[in-house]
Each structure stands twice: as C-alpha cells, then as structure tokens.
Amino acid sequence: KSPVFGPQEVSSVEGNSVSIKCYYPPTSVNRHTRKYWCRKGASGRCITLVSSEGYVSSNYAGRANLTNFPENGTFVVNIAQLSRDDSGHYKCGLGINSRGLSFDVSLEVSQGPELPNGTEVYTVDVGRTVTIKCPFKTENAPKTKALYKKIGQTSVLVIDSRNYVNPNYKDRIRLRIPGTGQLIFTVVIDRLRLSDHGLYLCQAGDGSNRDEKNADLQVLEPEPELVYEDLRGSVTFHCALGLEVANVAKFLCRVNSRETCDVVINTLGKRDSAFEGRILLNPQDKDGSFSVVITGLRKEDEGRYLCGAHSDGQLQEGWPIQAWQLFVNEESTIPRSPTVVKGVAGGSVAVLCPYNPKESQSLKYWCLWEGAQNGRCPLLVESQGLVQEQYEGRLSLLQEPGNGTFTVILNQLTTQDAGFYWCLTNGDTRWRTTVEIKIIEGEPNLKVPGNVTAVLGETLNIPCHFPCKFSSYEKYWCKWSNTGCQTLPSQDEGPSEAFVNCDENSRLVSLTLNPVTRADEGWYWCGVKQGHFYGETAAVYVAVEEKKVAGSRYVSPAKADAAPDEKVLDSGVREIENKAIQDPRLFAEEKVVADTGDQAGGSRASVDSSSSEEQGGSSK
C-alpha cells in the first residue's frame, strides 16, 4: 500500500481550475525527492505532465504547475482552463513514475449544466455583491419588473418593482429602474449566500409581449490561501473585499478550536494582546482594500485567518470574507536575535536587526510601533541618514556587522523610549522583525559630562569613564551626524598591561579636540565594541563659543556652585548624572571651560586611552 494519498475522484466543468493536493510522509528523503503528476495511457505507462523539477508538458504549458510544501508533506498540482480532453486517469507521486510511491486520481471534466440560450453567467464569492442586468423593450418600460429564482420546475418571486421582497433576501436586495431612455433594469444582491446559487429569470411586463432574460448565479466559497512564512519573520495579509464595503469596519480574525473567529485587529480599535507591538493594519485604499502585517512570527501564530467587513468589526455570516491558512516554518532562514533589549535611564541600547543577506544594498529602516487605533510605525532612522528631529544626537543606524545584520544604537534613554520597534528594509518584507526596549533600574556604565562648552581655538578634553568589565573592549569616540557616527582618530593608547589589574584611575578614554573650531560643535559619542558588535554608548553635546577674555579662565556660576546631584570631574567638565539630554539648547546657560594648553603633535581630534585592546566576543 502506497503511503501517498490524495483525492481518488476529482470532477469539474470545462473552463474551471482544479487544485489537487497529494500527501506524503514528510521524511527527509521524501521532502527533497522529485514530485510528479502523470497521465496513465492505454499501454499502462504514465506520461509526466508536470514535475517539481520544473518540467511542464506542452499540453500543460501556461496552465499548470506543481508546488511542493516540504514542511507539511504535501504537494499541489494546479491545472487551469480545463477541457473535456483532460478527463482521464492520473497519478501523483514521488521519485520515478514507474515505482510504487504514487496515488491514483480520476479526473472527470464535464460540459457543465445545459443553460437556456442567452443565459448570462455571474460567478461571485460568498458574501460579495452581484448586479444582474435585465434588458427590456420600450413597450414594457411602464410595466412591472421582477426577478424570479427557478427551483426545479417552479419560479419563486425574489423581488419586483411593486416593492415585494422575498424574506430570504430581506435587507440585501434592491431593484433599480433607470431613467427614461435606458432600457435595462438591474437587481443588486449584497452579502451573497451559498443558497443564492442557481438560475434566475428577469421579467419585464406580462403576457406574450413580456421580456425575459436568464441569469445563472454561481456563488463560490472562498478557498483559503495557503501561506508559508518563517519563524521570527513577517506575514502580510492583503484583503480586498470590494467597493460595496469600502466604508464598513474591517477586521482580521483567527479561527479558534470552537470554529468561532477571534478578532486579531479591527478598524474600530480592537487588538488581541498576543499581537501587541507586532501588528499593523495599513490604511485602506479607495477601493476598500487593506492589509495587515504581523511581525515576529511565532509557532503559535499558525492557524486560519479571515479578513472581513462588518459594522461590528467582527465576523458575521453573509458578509464578504477572505481566508488564509498560515503555516510557520521552524526551519527558519531568519536568525535568532533578542526580542527584548534592556537599557537603563540615561544609558543606551544596541539593537541587532536581521535582513535578507542577499539584499545587502537595500535601504535599512527602524521605526517605532505605535498602538493607537490600527497601529502605525513612523520611521525614526534610515540607512541613508534621515533621523527624526527629536532623536538627533542619540540615534544611529550602522551597516555593521553586515552580512544579514545591521545595528541600531539609541542612547540618552528615558522611560519614554520603552516600547516596540521594528527593523525593516525596502526589500524582502518577510524579514521585518520586532524588538521591545525595556527601561530597567540601574546606572549607565559609561559616564560622560552632561554637556560641554568649548572655547574656539583652545584645547578640549572630554573624559569617558568606563567600568572594569569593559577593559577588554575596544573603546572609541565618534562624532554623530544624521548619516552615522564618524569614528575619531585614535592616539597611541599606552601599555597593554594598564588594565591587567583594572586600575581605578586608568578606566578612562578621553577625546581631545585641538584646536577647537566651529565645525566641532555637535554631538559626540563615547562607546565600546567588540569587533563589529557594538555595546554601550554615551553622548555629550559640545557647544563652541568665542573666547571671553584673553588669557583668563571663565568659570560659570553653575560650575562654581555645583548642584548636589552633580559630580565635578577632574577634567574641569561637569557630569550631570542620569540626565538624558534631548536638546542641548535646554542647557545653554551651563558653560564649562576647556583646557587652554596646546597639544604638541598628534591629530587635531584624538582619543586618549590607556586601555589594552583585546578583541573579544560580542557585546550584544
């Protein structure tokens, strides 16, 4: 007995399509072996028509395909534009046609029902709207118009121009009679039901002069579309329900074990908490279509999803729907990356974002998920360098480490930064991922002055203190701009033994600007990294001003009278603890003096540290 299974009998009508699904045990060998669909001839041989290796016979060209779904041990043969010649005996199988792993399928294609001459065929999905057109002659213009449904040998009145409506069609049918000169009336049926399927008769007038037109209404069940996406990746459900419901509330729901449908998200503001931070309902187009994006896919997201329209924002019988069956592939191409990243107030986070490594040239983006109404995700930063204004000086997107991962650094954290953020590109949408930033109790590890005022033409020295745990990390200073953070040249960093015992006094990396110019004004970051993996950062704003009085050292009142929560550092620069500086102008009155001494030799901007630079693992 063959382990392959499928439908023994498939029947359809000319012009239709069939989708034949064959099941096989999903062993490793079976998953990767050739799949085929062949037709049995009189000789007993089975001639291949289509296979998983790309072969399509001339008879099937342009109208058939075979798709293998190895994750769940199935393959599907789609055949369109059926003709009666397609009737016959077939096999779906694995391996070689003449061997045992196959299943016999009988396909019967019939002519379709005999319809009265001139019958118009309307094919519409359940829940949608149909408009039946009924022509008539001038002499019948003033006479009664009606639509009947033929049931067996009898005709049942559905609607007429005398305001009769059959109870089965109540509140979802209307008969429209146009103005003079137009010799056609229409019957519009909304929210079609399967029971509406059948043959209808339009009639205008009575007696032997009456006008008649037959209409065959075929109401189709929406067959769920199979969607296969990777664990941790993203799925987009595109939902087009038609203009008739363009102004009706929309929803996406998931079918539960009781076969009712739980709302996942709707346009009335409802959202399932299981999808918090990782779902967006994109605004609908003029035609009423919309899409729902879910990121950070989990195995438990698998299931059947329906999108629909109804004023209550949830599933109701007879209203249009679209269906999907979502499968989440655990053998994911999307690498694991932290879904939660923690930082302290005043500190920083470095977020690793995966992207499709085949799309290294794609634009990279980072956005903040906002849950209000249908959800939105305004972009905060992109790889071309645009940064939202309120994130100036504290947000940067780096292409490193590359090869399928980019890095986003956010510093000067406040509790308001807690939330969900999305990593995305302008390429493969399935690689959208979500990360949650949580702000926890604690102190930043890197300590820099709150903000600094440098004097034009003089030397500025900014210290950055770091704890022993970063002694083996690479330390750097960089100047922030909206296109990134340009690393500043580093001086000779002294003996590598300096940190063997992690000397309290030597845990310092300093930035020297000599001489200070106008172009030096801006944000500077002190940071640690290991290879291409970035760790913590701290930011300081440097304001540049003219010399006050030649030869004198100006000390601001704020410096002379330091507040209790401020530590005065030995470089003559104040550190304001736990302040997340968003806008340097708020601190304009706090001026701190720069060193006046000229630095002999070396680069104009330099980083000074006595740290040993051991390349270690990741600081993720």
Epitope: S11, S17, V18, T123, R258
Partner: nanobody
Framework: EVQLVESGGGLVQAGDSLRLSCAAS????????MGWFRQAPGKEREFVAT??????????YYADFVKGRFTISRDNAKNTVYLQMDSLKPEDTAVYYC?????????????????WGQGTQVTVSS
C-alpha cells in the same frame, strides 16, 4: 455554530446497501468539506470518506478499505452529504459520524474537522 445531524443507519445483512445522510445547518461561515468517520466497538475512530468542493469542482477522498464499495456525494441546495454503502460486510459494523470543516488540512485527520454529528449506528449481520 454548525449543527450536523446523521440519519439512515440501521441493521442490514452482509452484501446489502445503506445510504447515510448528514444535514448541516446554522453556519457562521463557509464550510467547504464534509466527511464520514466510523468507530467500531473498542477501536479508534477512523476516516471513511470526505468530499471537498470549490464552486463547481469536487474532490472525493476514500479510505483504502472502501475499495469502490462506498460513494460520497452532496446536495448543495439541501446542504446535505450522503454516503452510499454497497456490498456491506460485518466488519463495516460501527457508529458512523459526519464531520465538517472550513479548511481541509488533511482529509484523514480527525483534528482537521471542527464540527461533528452525534453518530448513527450501522450494524451488518452475517
């Protein structure tokens, strides 16, 4: 909720025929596959036959033991599915259950069906 009501079971002689009916009512959204399972005393419930449809296309699935003896069909207008059982054998004795689903992942799998009837007894004497 979908309600399924089976009928047509009974006591017959080996070699005789029976026709089971399953009427569906009260749907919340489209059902597009209905089938029959059976459970003999002391055994697990097993797949017998399923019919799936999409517009005017139908797909019929049968268990190996059926071997051309059983035929599944449906009447769209009546929302009813039938199982015509010919050449019945004593080993066909079981309670026959009707099942329906809105999505058919695998016709043979019990968990692919969301709705179930109460069952109808078929007894075949030798």
């Amino acid at each position: 909720e979908v309600q399924l009501v089976e009928s047509g079971g009974g006591l017959v002689q080996a070699g005789d025929s029976l026709r089971l009916s399953c009427a569906a009512s009260g749907r919340t959204f489209p059902t597009y596959a209905m089938g029959w399972f059976r459970q003999a005393p002391g055994k697990e419930r097993e797949f017998v036959a399923t019919i799936r449809w999409s517009g005017s296309t139908q797909y019929k699935y049968y268990a190996d033991f059926v071997k051309g003896r059983f035929t599944i069909s449906r009447d769209n207008a009546k929302n009813t599915v039938y199982l015509q059982m010919d050449s019945l054998k004593p080993e066909d004795t079981a309670v026959y259950y009707c099942a329906a689903t809105t999505l058919l992942t695998d016709p043979r799998a019990l968990n692919a069906y969301a709705y179930w009837g109460q069952g109808t007894q078929v007894t075949v004497s030798s």
